[in-house]
């Protein structure tokens, strides 16, 4: 019963981290403009893996498509890689793990074939997550080291022409997102290879059975009967490190249509 | 068609508050955000303050912090902005104006002008 | 605050003849974000209020006749009447459009010579 619940858990939360990379991937807010020295502003600049937007007072917001593919910077092409790989794998993760579920019966599928789903879709999870968090921190990394630059050189010269005011961006909510998202698939995948032990079939070995003739009298001698669970070695007292997701304190809102920041 | 319809002129004492009506027609009062322009005689415009008739939110120019208060009445369609402790150069023509929403945050639609006029 | 210049403060120009505004801006108005200008121009008439003639720093309001223009980017702006009408006396005003709180320039008063 503790493994099905695991198991059924497992999946759960890597269905929810996984909905959470996919909601994270498509976001716009992966970037916003620093509101630190204004916190009101007449023009709102924020930025995601796929376009750029701007939102005026008047609430009305213009998204930009990077249209272009060689001009983009590596590490925003790698960052993309990772969230797809994150994603992918997570779909055929949960793909192979509903199939892995003890409380579906599809067949006559054998309870070893079932554990070593359970196992490659928890993998999956887990690798998933991973990607998710490490293309999160890819891009967190990218902005740290974008805003103190800007800081330090706040105004940049367009053309040697036009003095500008370099806009500088902080952490947009789609970071919080992925993060959460992608310890959410780690943890559901840690839990779905916890499920696959409970879920390896009882080894049922018979000694052999050796009967001896003296005279008339037959001697039967039964042998000891041992199971055990688990694949290979005895797997008691062994215990489960899992870190939990950390996620900042702080809540970004971002306003409707009507609002104006 | 469009139109913001502001109230009478008014002569106010110094120290005095004066409270202006902009009724709005013509458009979607809510999708718009409301703005208040002052005008000196012979002088330029000078922007005091915005307020979102959708949620009601406000953001004033900091000159007037503490002394105007622009708020909205969503079931006349019309915005009030009332400034308070008027000082002798607080005379001048104050008009409403609305906010273009894809017009680069321009003002397209403007009310006639209220002349409030401070004085002992 | 962002503070905004006009030159001149008044103009004669005879009728049929191209009339010339300046505004500059003591800090950029161009937005990285969308690539645009956050620069609007007004005409105000005696005893009216302003009429938006540019926003964007170039794109003309609907109704706006084509002799108006607008251009410049960053914090050089120019307004053009290509072929100056009676109808076109006026003072005309730049808006900072980018930046709270926004600013006007202080005016450039165009007559007939």
């Known amino acids: 019963m503790a493994v099905t619940a695991c198991q059924g858990l497992g999946f759960v939360v890597s269905l929810i981290g996984i909905a959470g990379i996919i909601a994270a991937t498509c976001m716009d807010q992966w970037s916003t403009q620093d509101l630190y020295n204004n916190p009101v502003t007449a023009v709102f600049n924020y930025q995601g893996l796929w376009r750029s937007c701007v939102r005026e007072s008047s609430g009305f917001t213009e998204c930009r498509g990077y249209f272009t593919l060689l001009g983009l910077p590596a590490m925003l092409q790698a960052v993309r890689a990772l969230m797809i790989v994150g994603i992918v794998l997570g779909a055929i993760g949960l793909l192979v793990s509903i199939f892995a579920l003890k409380c579906i019966r599809i067949g006559s599928m054998e309870d070893s074939a079932k554990a070593n789903m359970t196992l490659t879709s928890g993998i999956m999870f887990i690798v998933s997550g991973l990607c998710a968090i490490a293309g999160v921190s890819v891009f967190a990394n990218m902005l740290v080291t974008n805003f103190w630059m800007s800081t330090a050189n706040m105004y940049t010269g367009m053309g040697g022409m036009v003095q500008t005011v370099q806009t500088r961006y902080t952490f947009g909510a789609a970071l919080f997102v992925g993060w959460v998202a992608g310890g959410l698939t780690l943890i559901g995948g840690v839990m779905m290879c916890i499920a696959c032990r409970g879920l390896a079939p009882e080894e049922t070995n018979y000694k052999a059975v050796s009967y001896h003739a003296s005279g008339h009298s037959v001697a039967y001698k039964p042998g000891g009967f041992k199971a055990s669970t688990g694949f290979g070695s005895n797997t008691k007292n062994k215990k489960i490190y899992d870190g939990g997701a950390r996620t900042e304190d702080e809540v970004q809102s971002y306003p409707s249509k009507h609002d104006y920041v | 068609q469009v139109q913001l319809v502001q109230s009478g002129a008014e002569v106010k004492k110094p120290g005095a508050s004066v409270k202006v009506s902009c009724k709005t027609s013509g458009y979607s009062f809510t999708d718009y955000l409301m703005l208040w322009v002052r005008q000196a005689h012979g002088q330029s415009l000078e922007w005091m303050g915005n307020i979102n008739p959708y949620y009601g939110r406000t953001t004033y120019a900091l000159k007037f912090k503490g002394r105007v208060t622009m708020t909205v009445d969503r079931s006349t369609s019309t915005v009030y902005m009332e400034l308070s402790s008027l000082r002798s150069e607080d005379t001048a023509v104050y008009y409403c104006a609305r906010d273009g929403y894809s017009l680069r945050n321009a003002m397209d639609y403007w009310g006639q002008g209220t002349l409030v006029t401070v004085s002992s | 605050d962002i503070v905004m210049t006009q030159s001149p403060d008044s103009l004669a120009v005879s009728l049929g003849e191209r009339a010339t505004i300046n505004c500059k801006s003591s800090q950029s108005l161009f937005n990285s974000g969308n690539q645009k200008n956050y620069l609007a121009w007004y005409q105000q008439k005696p005893g009216q209020p302003p009429k938006l003639l540019i926003y964007g720093a170039s794109t003309r309001e609907s109704g706006v006749p084509d002799r108006f223009s607008g251009s410049g980017s960053g914090t050089d702006f120019t307004l053009t009447i290509s072929s100056l009408q009676a109808e076109d006396v006026a003072v005309y005003y730049c808006?900072?459009?980018?930046?709270?709180?926004?600013?006007f320039g202080q005016g450039t008063k165009v007559e007939i010579k």
């Open positions: 808006q900072n459009a980018h930046s709270y709180p926004y600013t």
